[in-house]
């Protein structure tokens, strides 16, 4: 014999108190699959959480975090405090990146500046707490004759002949 509850669609529950007829989920509850004997209570996005998607009779509410926080975990189970760019979150709260490190996001850790010399390059733009260094061409590339763009010859002072 087929279970009469199997005919109850999502958004309803099989009501044992009413001869197993399909009743709609009460307010603030949902059933995402058919054949359910109860509806689940909707998640409430309060406090540090805010509603990203309202609960419906067939799907749970979805939360994200209020401004100043970002989501952690599947389904945004927790929130983590944001910091400013140039900072990282520590046990004592947000702290500035140490010299030689940077963070260009509101989350995550400060990372060391790129070491341009490891790639045989020079520093074109210095790093900051918020930005990595920008590496330029290698010093060898900057020597005269090594580049397709020839730098102008230095101006000679009058009365001096080349050595």
């Amino acid at each position: 014999l087929q279970d009469p509850c199997s005919n109850c669609p999502a958004g309803t529950f099989c009501d044992n108190n009413r001869n197993q007829i399909c009743s709609p989920c009460p307010p603030n509850s949902f059933s995402s699959a058919g054949g359910q004997r109860t509806c689940d209570i909707c998640r409430q996005c309060k406090g540090v959480f805010r509603t990203r998607k309202e609960c419906s009779s067939t799907s749970n509410a979805e939360c994200d975090c209020t401004p100043g926080f970002h989501c952690l975990g599947a389904g945004c189970s927790m929130c983590e405090q944001d910091c400013k760019q140039g900072q990282e979150l520590t046990k004592k709260g947000c702290k500035d990146c140490c010299f030689g490190t940077f963070n260009d996001q509101k989350r995550g850790i400060c990372r060391p500046w790129t070491n341009c010399s490891l790639d045989g390059k020079s520093v074109l733009v210095n790093g900051t707490k918020e930005r990595d260094v920008v590496c330029g061409p290698s010093p060898a590339d900057l020597s005269p004759g090594a580049s397709s763009v020839t730098p102008p010859a230095p101006a000679r002072e009058p009365g001096h002949s080349p050595q």
């Epitope: 309060k46 540090v48 952690l72 975990g73 927790m78 929130c79 983590e80 405090q81 979150l89 046990k91």
Partner: nanobody
Framework: EVQLVESGGGLVQPGGSLRLSCAAS????????MGWVRQAPGKGREFVSA????????YYADSVKGRFTISRDNSKNTLYLQMNSLRAEDTAVYYC?????????????????????WGQGTQVTVSS
């Protein structure tokens, strides 16, 4: 056996201060996110503040921001709530709660279902 024991409540005049404590035992305190929740007579639960397991992230409800400070001492297994500039509307029973956040040491939550353990509460009355 897990225990959360609140203390520090009492009667205080408007504008006054109180410091609530919550002594925890029976679980690895530093792995648990903690929260303070209050319930005024005839009203629902309100999450006042929350703090991550390592103390790095903190959350405050708008109604207490700038007046209350949450902190924890993991060496003493104790959670605190420093309450300044108290108002009549802060009158409530204050509960501390603990939820396992081992995976997210900087995580906070204000979802009651996240919290595994709850204290018995301490009464705070703000009245002249």
């Amino acid at each position: 056996e897990v225990q959360l024991v609140e203390s520090g409540g009492g009667l205080v005049q408007p504008g006054g201060s109180l410091r609530l404590s919550c002594a925890a035992s029976g679980f690895t305190f530093s792995s648990y996110a903690m929260g303070w929740v209050r319930q005024a007579p005839g009203k629902g639960r309100e999450f006042v503040s929350a703090i991550s397991g390592n103390g790095g992230s903190t959350y405050y409800a708008d109604s207490v921001k700038g007046r209350f400070t949450i902190s924890r001492d993991n060496s003493k297994n104790t959670l605190y709530l420093q309450m300044n500039s108290l108002r009549a509307e802060d009158t409530a029973v204050y509960y501390c709660a603990a939820g396992d956040a081992y995976v997210y040491p900087y995580g906070v939550s204000t979802d009651p279902s996240f919290y595994d353990y709850w204290g018995q509460g301490t009464q705070v009355t703000v009245s002249s």
